[in-house]
């Protein structure tokens, strides 16, 4: 008796796909050992067709896959485009050789069934419409026409030309003739349901001179498309239900025992479990739409169905498309915080992972909005202008090679609470969802800037100080000038390593920035922040206004402005003559030709790439005192 288990007999027809699940005992060795699928030969040798080591035989090229699900102690073999040559005896098994633990599987692939010559076969999916063609001779042109359904020996009338319609086909069946045709009539049956399947006979005339045609109607449940996705990645369900339902409400539902629970529909319904991580996007006027779900969880695995009906709910006899989603827990996507908490007036630094192989991809951050079908307008990106309302308080810091970028949002308000997505123009699986929760602040912020009303005078020296608590003592402090393409850290150089101090005077922890001399282009937002290596922490922002010197304005002596720098050993001062090149860049709509749920962030095109790199001086010069 083998401890491996699976289906003993699998039967399908040519052109179809099979998905064979093999179950193995839940042990560490089994979870990680080689999985294989081989074909049993007459000589007793079992030839490997596919294995988890990456081997794929020539005859399976482009049509088969083997996926291990260690968390379920299963592996799945998918084989598409079946032919009768695939009929045979196989083994699914575990081990370094094909003689280890295995289970015998018999696969039988049949031809599509044939019917007698006078039988026309109609194959339709549930919810679709069939048009049955009925030919007759001229002698029956004026005779009664009918369609009946065989039930045993009897044939029960479905519809006839006297306007009789069987109650179970009411509003679904019509009998008609096209144009001037004198030898053919048609019966349309719409909103097909499984019980409509069977043998039909259409007839023109009565008695021995009647003309009869046989029609075999097969009504198929949609075969689910199998989707294999990693934990924390995203999935897109592409739904194409046809023109006939273009104007009906669309939905995506998840099969739950006997019902199909709507996750999202175009009438505004949305399952709370998918809040912040789902978008429904119409694709065209023909009823095509897509549903994107990010931040996949283990419990998202299951059977999904999209459909259309005026109610926005599943309805028997309406077209559907089906998927089975598998969520693999062995994910390449790192676990990142799904909830980030901030306080009003404070800041948050959100780390967004991306595929490390795509470090040159464009990075974006968008705000998920619940209205209608959900949308996610881009707020900031490596080539996108910061959206209105976020100027001076939002920046994206790319960290090439680290597999992550950081988005910092400061001057938080409770209106900033909500869901945000990290995404790139590269690997679409690497989309992460973050919920930002902003609470009312109950204490003073950790970083405070003085003076708070910052107005600098052209030609003079201007110093601004940032007070930080002792807990930031060992962290790197920085000032940066915010612009539409990031916050460029003002250059500085340490004059010798600072002496570590056993005691920390809370009042004297200051990092200062000096503009000397002030120029008109120095006007703008400045951030004071702390970081450790590439890990960004708290920030605070201040707007520095620049004005011409008026006759009565006091002249500040540069030495006085920096006097505190000599008195406070813990203070770091940065002096900068800031030259900012404001590279205003845009999100190119072509990047998302297929992903229109991400809203375009601006309306100017920009060729040169804006850099949001922490530490890039962007043409600034200055020195640290």
């Amino acid at each position: 008796q083998s401890p491996i288990f699976g289906p003993q007999d699998v039967s399908s027809i040519e052109g179809n796909s099979v998905s064979i699940t093999c179950y193995y005992p839940d042990t560490s060795v089994n979870r990680h050992t080689r999985k294989y699928w081989c074909r049993q030969g007459a000589n007793g040798y079992c030839a490997t067709l596919i294995s988890s080591n990456g081997y794929l035989s020539k005859e399976y090229s482009g049509r088969a896959s083997l996926i291990n699900f260690p968390e379920n102690s299963t592996f799945v073999i998918n084989i598409a485009h079946l032919t009768q040559e695939d009929t045979g005896s196989y083994k699914c098994g575990l081990g370094t050789t094909n003689r280890g633990l295995f289970f015998d599987v018999s696969l039988e692939v049949s031809q599509v069934p044939e019917f007698p010559n006078d039988t026309h076969v109609y194959t339709k999916d549930i919810g679709r419409t069939v048009t049955i063609e009925c030919r007759f001779k001229e002698g029956n042109a004026h005779s009664k026409k009918s369609l009946c359904k065989k039930r045993g020996e009897a044939c029960e009338v479905v519809i006839d030309s006297t306007e009789y319609v069987d109650p179970s086909y009411k509003d679904r069946a019509i009998l008609f003739m096209k144009g001037t045709s004198r030898d053919i009539f048609y019966v349309n049956i719409s909103h097909l349901i499984p019980s409509d399947a069977g043998l039909y006979v259409c007839q023109a005339g009565e008695g021995p001179s009647a003309d009869k045609n046989n029609a075999d109607l097969q009504v198929l449940e949609p075969e689910p498309e199998l989707l294999y996705k990693d934990l924390r990645s995203s999935v897109t369900f592409e739904c194409d239900l046809g023109r006939e339902v273009a104007n009906d409400a669309k939905y995506l539902c998840r099969k739950n025992k006997e019902t199909c629970d709507v996750i999202i529909n175009t009438l505004g319904k949305r399952d709370p479990a998918f809040e912040g991580r789902i978008l429904l996007t119409p694709r065209d006027d023909n009823g095509r739409f897509s549903v994107l779900i990010t931040g996949l969880r283990k419990e998202d695995a299951g059977h999904y169905q999209c459909g259309a009906h005026s109610s926005g709910l599943p309805q028997e006899g309406w077209p559907v498309q089906a998927w089975q989603l598998f969520v693999n827990e062995e994910s390449t996507i790192p676990n990142s915080r799904s909830v980030v908490k901030g306080v009003t007036g404070g800041s948050v630094a959100i780390v967004c992972p991306y595929n490390p192989k795509e470090s040159s991809s464009l990075k974006y951050w968008c705000h998920w909005e619940a209205d209608e079908n959900g949308r996610c307008p881009v707020l900031v990106g490596t080539q996108a202008l910061v959206q209105e309302g976020y100027e001076g308080r939002l920046a994206l810091f790319d960290q090439p090679g680290s597999g992550a970028y950081t988005v910092i949002l400061n001057q938080l308000t409770t209106q900033d609470s909500g869901f945000y997505w990290c995404l790139t123009d590269g690997d679409s699986r690497w989309r992460t969802t973050i919920e930002l929760q902003v609470a009312e602040a109950t204490k003073k912020p950790d970083l405070e800037v003085t003076p708070q009303n910052a107005t600098a005078v052209i030609g003079e020296t201007f110093t601004i100080s940032c007070h930080y608590p002792c807990k930031f003592y060992s962290q790197e402090k920085y000032w940066c000038k915010w612009s539409n393409d990031g916050c460029h850290i003002l250059p500085s150089h340490d004059e010798g390593a600072r002496q570590s101090s056993v005691s920390c005077d809370q009042s004297s922890q200051i990092v200062s920035m000096t503009l000397n001399p002030v120029k008109k282009e120095d006007e703008g937002w400045y951030w004071c922040g702390v970081k450790e290596g590439q890990v960004y922490g708290e920030t605070t922002a201040i707007y520095v206004a620049v004005e011409e010197r008026t006759r009565g304005s006091p002249h500040i002596n540069p030495t006085d402005a920096n006097a505190r720098a000599k008195d406070a050993p813990e203070e770091e001062a940065m002096e900068s003559s800031v030259r900012e090149d404001e590279n205003k860049a845009n999100l190119d709509p072509r990047l998302f030709a297929d992903e229109r749920e991400i809203q375009n962030a601006g309306d100017q095109a920009q060729e040169n790439r804006a850099s949001g790199n922490a530490g890039s001086a962007g043409g600034q010069s200055g020195s640290s005192k």
Partner: nanobody, 127 residues
């Protein structure tokens, strides 16, 4: 109201044959998996055989103890399930239950993976 009704049980001599049938009515779906389980007196319900459907592909599963002796068949659209039992043994004596589930998902041997159940039909193998 969902009903699964089993029939075909009875008393049979060792080595004999029986055919069990199950008809499901009121199911809100064309069942994607149907199965037979057996419960001998004082024992747990045990998996016997199952059939799963995905589109026009069927998957048949058997317990080791019945392989080669029992054959499961069914019709997804008609919601029917049959079990042809040959070469019956005294240890096959049990109450046989029909079970149905909307998805061909999860381990078919686990009774918890089925939502609907019949009342059972008794099979007794004795000389």
């Amino acid at each position: 109201q969902v009903q699964l009704v089993e029939s075909g049980g009875g008393l049979v001599q060792p080595g004999g044959s029986l055919r069990l049938s199950c008809v499901a009515s009121g199911l809100p779906f064309s069942s994607s998996r149907m199965a037979w389980f057996a419960q001998a007196p004082g024992k747990e319900r045990e998996f016997v055989a199952a059939i799963g459907w995905r589109g026009r592909t069927s998957y048949k599963y058997y317990a080791d103890s019945v392989k080669g002796r029992f054959t499961v068949s069914g019709d997804n659209a008609k919601k029917t399930l049959d079990l042809q039992m040959k070469d019956l043994k005294p240890e096959d004596t049990a109450l046989y239950f029909c079970a149905a589930h909307p998805n061909d998902d999860g381990d078919p041997r686990i009774s918890g993976n089925y939502q609907y159940w019949g009342q059972g039909t008794q099979v007794t193998v004795s000389s």
